[in-house]
């Protein structure tokens, strides 16, 4: 195909590949009606003048995970029809002014994953066109007011995996079409006010594991199209009651991994399409009524491993949309009778590794459609009458590591486990913890006469069955896997995966998967 | 239909301790959160903690902190509570009452007024 | 801990007059306020809660609202069995705290 060199493979739709460590130059001479060039995986270390010059149609040019340290400014001369260049994964520290010059329908530009020390508003000066711009993956300490002002049709950029210790509110002003900026992993500690206010069409910004302790109150007010906020892993101790008030289109948000002590009242709101809410990891003490009342749409909760002691009856108003509940490994010893009376549809609720001694009797009573109750390691020596009997599609139980106490006042609860044995799984079944001469034995086939011999056993009326459909997936919406895993977080590392499935790890989580970034 | 009923008014000495019960009826007693609210004569309404008559933890407001006590029976479905080392300032109806569908009281008892006199 | 300062202390009006009782938090509750009515030698009749619902066998002429910090109670039009004390409670946040109360008395 018009002369391919030896160390390339050609294929007749002009694509042009030349891979493998033998190659220290770029190869020659390459076939003119090239329009896709990569170089991967090479030991080349520089590019000199010009080496594109005869394949003036090349369209996307890929020169990645080489040894590339040094290129010369009319490197990528002639090269006016790309519209995509990578440079990403190779040890470039410095960037020539004037390297993209004559590049009038580059769109997007990859320099991700190298050791870039600064970059300068002249870099960007010349691509006007650019709509992509991958920053992230180097060693960026700060960014010069003026260098992205020329790229007014930028869409998308990432600037993560850096060491941006701040950021000037100046940076980001002429970047009116901008829809997703990524800042995670530097060591930003503040925003300032007006850093985003330029960004009307933002639609995703990733600002986790930063080191931000506080947010200003209006950081985000002109942020109306924003849909993804992510600020985990970062330092937030407090969130302004106003922080949140203009993000009408939000749908994610997490906030996992901080210092939060309280949700102040109304802070999440009115967010009619939030869908995912994820606060584990934080110091979470108590929550208030209403304090979720503005997420009509919510079917996340994620409130694990906090220390949640207290929850108000009214906690939960307003989650008539909530399928998914995560409360573990947390401080709670009681729950009202009223508290989860307005999650009609919730599916899955984790309430394992509190201090649970009893739940009220009707404490699942308007959740109908519960699928999964994780309830093991609590304080739990009994369960009251009845308690799951209207749970027609429950078909997962997890109760053990409980204290329970098998006297007589047990059997209602073994019968119904009796008959209900495939929901407990297989893996671990509650134990009697006293009488001492039945400790350590199965919940399920314990003989309750040989527990309290001097005790006469009344007939007691047993839970009564609820069916057992063994044919029935566990969770038919796509949205969820076994209901013992929870992610670390939502996925934010923006891979092409839509669905991400996890492994059982029982003693850290206890949720669904989530989808990715 | 949920009903809270108080023991009858107390005269105490400066210095004593008063106990008021508070028994509950028409729902399952162990289930909910139920709240002591004192009243000063000619005064407004004070909140002094409450019980989770299920498991008998409490939490009281700090300013009664040591010298309140509220303790549960579930036999009779009836919570206590103590006040102890009393003082004019303390003379007051105090009331049960228990939560509805929010941190708001939404049955009361019908207040037993508790008068400290020397 | 939480302030909750009502106005007026006391108001006159008549029969069929609307009435309006303010309560200002002295800092964030959301919308968890109650607002209750007693009548002398009662206990306290819940009427209001999360700020604007009424509670169920509550006339209509009885509203709420506000949010954050300033809360209002209005009686649409008086009737002879409204002359009584009114108060506000937050149940944001431990410890939970009433206003001083408003006392509705007949013109």
């Known amino acids: 195909y018009h002369g391919c060199p030896s160390e390339c493979t050609c294929s007749r739709a002009s694509q042009v590949e030349c891979t493998g460590a033998r190659i220290v130059a770029v190869p020659t001479p390459l076939p003119w009606n090239a329009m896709s060039l990569q170089i991967l995986n090479t030991h080349i270390t520089e590019l000199n003048e010009s080496p594109f010059l005869n394949i003036s149609a090349l369209i996307a040019l890929r020169i990645e995970k080489n040894e590339l340290s040094r290129i010369t400014p009319g490197a990528f001369r002639n090269l006016g029809s790309l519209r995509y260049l990578s440079l990403a994964n190779n040890k470039l520290q410095v960037l020539p002014i004037g390297l993209f010059q004559g590049l009038d329908s580059l769109e997007s530009l990859l320099l991700s994953s190298n050791q870039l020390l600064q970059i300068q508003p002249a870099h960007f000066s010349q691509c006007s066109n650019l709509k992509e711009l991958q920053l992230h993956g180097n060693h960026l300490e700060y960014i010069p007011d003026g260098a992205f002002d020329h790229l007014v049709g930028l869409t998308k950029l990432n600037l993560g995996k850096n060491s941006l210790t701040h950021i000037s509110p100046r940076v980001f002003q002429h970047l009116g079409n901008l829809q997703v900026l990524r800042l995670y992993e530097n060591r930003l500690t503040d925003i300032p006010m007006g850093t985003f206010d330029g960004l009307v069409n933002l639609q995703e910004l990733a600002l986790q594991q930063n080191q931000i302790g506080l947010l200003s109150p209006g950081l985000f007010h002109n942020n109306h199209n924003l849909q993804r906020l992510y600020l985990s892993n970062n330092h937030i101790s407090q969130l302004p009651p106003s922080v949140f008030m203009q993000l009408p289109q939000l749908n994610r948000l997490t906030l996992f991994g901080n210092s939060l002590k309280e949700l102040s009242p109304g802070i999440f709101g009115p967010m009619p399409n939030l869908r995912e809410l994820w606060l584990y990891d934080n110091h979470i003490s108590s929550l208030p009524d209403n304090v979720f009342s503005n997420l009509r749409q919510l079917q996340v909760l994620i409130l694990s491993r906090n220390q949640i002691s207290f929850i108000s009856p009214g906690a939960f108003n307003g989650l008539t949309e909530l399928r998914e509940l995560s409360l573990h490994t947390n401080a709670l010893q009681d729950l009202d009778g009223n508290v989860f009376r307005m999650l009609a549809n919730l599916q899955n609720i984790s309430l394992q590794n509190n201090r649970l001694r009893q739940l009220p009797g009707n404490i699942f009573a308007n959740v109908n459609g519960l699928m999964a109750i994780q309830l093991q390691n609590n304080q739990l020596e009994n369960l009251p009458l009845g308690i799951f009997d209207h749970l027609g599609k429950l078909c997962e139980l997890r109760l053990y590591d409980n204290p329970w106490r098998c006297d007589s006042d047990i059997l209602p609860l073994r019968n119904w486990l009796l008959l209900n044995q495939p929901r407990l799984g297989t893996d671990t079944v509650p134990v009697c913890f006293s009488p001492a001469n039945v400790r350590g034995q199965s919940l399920i086939i314990i003989n309750v006469n040989v527990a309290v011999p001097s005790v006469h056993v009344p007939e007691v009326p047993s839970y009564p069955e609820t069916p057992w459909y063994p044919d029935t997936p566990s969770y038919p919406d796509t949205t969820s896997v076994s209901s013992t895993t929870e992610l670390t977080s939502p996925v934010e590392d923006y891979t092409d995966l839509t669905t991400i499935q996890v492994t059982d790890d029982r003693s850290v989580w206890g949720m669904t998967q989530a989808q990715s970034g | 239909q949920v009903q809270l009923v108080q023991s009858g008014a107390e005269v105490k000495k400066p210095g004593a301790s008063v106990k008021v019960s508070c028994k509950a009826s028409?729902?399952?007693?162990?289930?909910?959160?139920i709240n002591w609210v004192r009243q000063a004569p000619g005064q407004g309404l004070e909140w002094m903690g409450w019980?989770?008559?299920?498991?008998?933890?409490?939490k009281y407001a700090q300013k009664f902190q040591g010298r309140v006590t509220m303790t549960v029976d579930t036999s009779t479905s009836t919570v206590y509570m103590e006040l102890s080392s009393l003082r004019s300032e303390d003379t007051a109806v105090y009331y049960c009452?228990?939560?509805?569908?929010?941190?708001?009281?939404?049955?009361w008892g019908q207040g037993t007024l508790v008068t400290v006199s020397s | 801990d939480i302030q909750m300062t009502q106005s007026p202390s006391s108001l006159s009006a008549s029969v069929g007059d609307r009435v309006t009782i303010t309560c200002k938090a002295s800092?964030?509750?959301?919308?968890?306020v109650a607002w209750y009515q007693q009548k002398p030698g009662k206990a306290p009749k819940l009427l209001i809660y999360?700020?604007?619902y009424r509670s169920s066998g509550v006339p209509s002429r009885f509203s709420g609202s506000g949010s954050g910090t300033d809360f209002t109670l209005t009686i649409s039009s008086l009737q002879p069995e409204d002359f009584a004390t009114y108060y506000c409670?937050?149940?944001?946040?431990?410890?939970?705290?009433f206003g001083g109360g408003t006392k509705v008395e007949i013109k």
């Open positions: 009452a228990r939560w509805g569908y929010g941190a708001y009281f939404t049955y």
């Open positions: 800092q964030n509750v959301g919308i968890n």
């Open positions: 028409g729902y399952t007693f162990t289930d909910y959160y």
């Open positions: 999360s700020a604007s």
């Open positions: 409670q937050q149940y944001n946040s431990f410890p939970y705290t």
């Open positions: 019980i989770y008559p299920g498991s008998g933890n409490t």
